[in-house]
Interface confidence: medium
């Protein structure tokens, strides 16, 4: 901790400006008023302070706001945000999407840090649900964000937010997460015509039940093998050879290359050999 020392004569900072970069740590502690710092936080980012100097400024804010910073200060933290610990952030009440964006911008291009994860958690909990604008913002900064949430957290995503989800946002989702998201997507896209509906719902099909796959097989959709391989094994097993043939269309020949992998392997073992032979692919049950 920086020692408490009196500010030398004539050194009291009337405002936050470039001259402060020449102050030693103890001078910053003694000569910069914490309330002044709080009201002029937006200037700090434009000044090339050292990490040690930023530590002093953070310490001053901590003393001024022991219960947590107000949002007016949080919004202008800039690079000082990188100095915050998850414990600091848990004290905050962040409600503005603009504040969230400002802080995510500071961390842009890096992996999601514990600080950012805590910030997002505080923000989403404060809002009560993962609304569309929040989801838009978070997936823009972290395309894999959605798949980092637990099924319980995903249950707070309203169907209207599903329109914000892009195919790449679901790349790392596991079946438990897709189980939650699929019914929401089905509801969100229900008014679309057949071919557009299929392309929109495709990324979510890892959560689809057997009856929905059977229905899709009647719609001439030509599902690609990459999508088929992500389907739930328990949803695929009850499908007949004819249904899989209709579901995959011209992609059905790709089953041969995947015959040793789930869910294809398990599905093949459930079929009658006579039925498999109708595909002409040499699949052995």
């Amino acid at each position: 901790e920086v020692e408490k020392t009196a500010c030398p004569s004539g050194k009291k900072a009337p405002e936050i400006d470039e001259s402060l970069i020449f102050y030693k740590k103890w001078e910053l502690e003694a000569c910069v008023d914490a309330a002044l710092l709080a009201t002029q936080m937006d200037r700090v980012n434009a000044i090339p302070f050292t990490y040690e100097q930023l530590d002093v400024l953070k310490h001053k804010l901590d003393e001024l706001y022991p219960q947590g910073y107000p949002e007016s200060v949080i919004q202008h933290l800039g690079y000082l945000f990188l100095k915050m610990s998850p414990e600091d952030i848990r004290k905050w009440n962040v409600t503005s999407l603009e504040t969230l964006k400002a802080l995510l911008e500071v961390n842009k291009g890096h992996e999601m840090s514990p600080q950012v994860a805590t910030l997002i958690d505080r923000f989403v909990k404060g809002r009560g649900q993962l609304d569309k604008d929040t989801l838009d913002t978070l997936t823009a900064f972290y395309p894999g964000y959605l798949c980092s949430l637990s099924p319980e957290e995903l249950s707070s995503v309203p169907p209207s937010s599903i329109w914000a989800v892009r195919p790449q946002d679901l790349d790392t989702c596991d079946p438990r997460q897709l189980d939650v998201l699929y019914p929401k997507a089905r509801l969100a896209f229900q008014n679309m015509n057949g071919s557009e509906y299929f392309v929109k719902i495709q990324s979510f099909l890892g959560g689809a039940p057997t009856e929905d796959l059977k229905a899709l097989s009647q719609q001439n959709v030509s599902m690609d093998l990459a999508t088929f391989m992500k389907l739930r094994t328990d949803a695929v097993l009850p499908l007949t050879v004819a249904e899989v043939q209709k579901l995959l269309g011209p992609h059905v020949e790709g089953l041969k290359a995947e015959e040793r992998h789930r869910p294809v392997r398990d599905w093949i073992l459930r079929q009658r050999q006579d039925d498999l032979d109708t595909l002409g692919l040499g699949l052995q049950g």
Epitope: K132, D133, D136, M192, S195, E196, Y197, K200
Partner: antibody, heavy 116, light 108 residues
């Protein structure tokens, strides 16, 4: 049937702003993205950004952030794009399109000419 | 962002000739999200094929699309006069959405 009707041609001075409109009919306006696309004479198609009228949610091509602003009025089923601080580089045809899984329907385009 | 490169930029074909144009992506695009549009002078673009190989409503059967990953193509089995136009490929997979530079197809 689905139709997107865009506002008429605009002749603007450099530095001015212009607001283009795109009126949608024949489908549920709130349930599809409205995309905006720029085409300069003799050039290809360039995606500007999109708005989902149901929520007002927007996504912008980084290149057009600060240049284009999207809004939508669900009572009149109309999407708007405002272009600010116009320069001669903004002279182009601007299209709106409806997107579900692709840009299935396009407006007729609005020609914006920026000239001193 | 995904850059789509179309080749050739301009091509001419005789009536009845087989025509193929290509679209190469800078990184992999799911075939479900790769589409082609046709544009004629003075008109808006029209959806021509969707999800790589599906013909949009009203598109003649002489057109076909194929491809996967980073390589896609649009083929006309037998060129007709009305096919003269500019064709754009488009990816709707990863934002920002991008278009190829276009292939202008003329009659020889």
């Amino acid at each position: 049937q689905v139709q997107l009707q865009q506002s008429g041609a605009e002749l603007m001075k450099p530095g001015a702003s212009v607001k283009l409109s795109c009126k949608a009919t024949g489908y549920t306006f709130t349930g599809y993205w409205i995309e905006w696309v720029k085409q300069r004479p003799g050039h290809g198609l360039e995606w500007i950004g999109e708005i989902l009228p149901g929520s007002g949610s927007t996504n912008y091509n980084e290149k057009f952030k600060g240049k284009a602003t999207f809004t939508a009025d669900t009572s009149s089923n109309t999407a708007y794009m405002q272009l600010s601080s116009l320069t001669t580089e903004d002279s182009a045809i601007y299209y709106c399109a409806r997107a579900g899984a692709w840009f299935a329907y396009w407006g007729q385009g609005t020609l914006v000419t920026v000239s001193a | 962002q995904i850059v789509l490169t179309q080749s050739p930029a301009i091509m001419s074909a005789s009536l009845g000739e087989r025509v193929t144009m290509t679209c190469t992506a800078s990184s992999s695009v799911s075939s479900s999200y790769l589409h082609w549009y046709q544009q004629k002078p003075g008109s808006s673009p029209k959806l021509w094929t969707y999800s790589t190989s599906n013909l949009a409503s009203g598109v003649p059967a002489r057109f076909s699309g194929s491809g996967s990953g980073t390589s896609y193509s649009l083929t006309i089995s037998s060129m007709e006069a009305e096919d003269a136009a500019t064709y754009y490929c488009h990816q709707y997979h990863r934002s920002p959405w991008t278009f190829g530079g276009g292939t202008k197809l003329e009659i020889k």
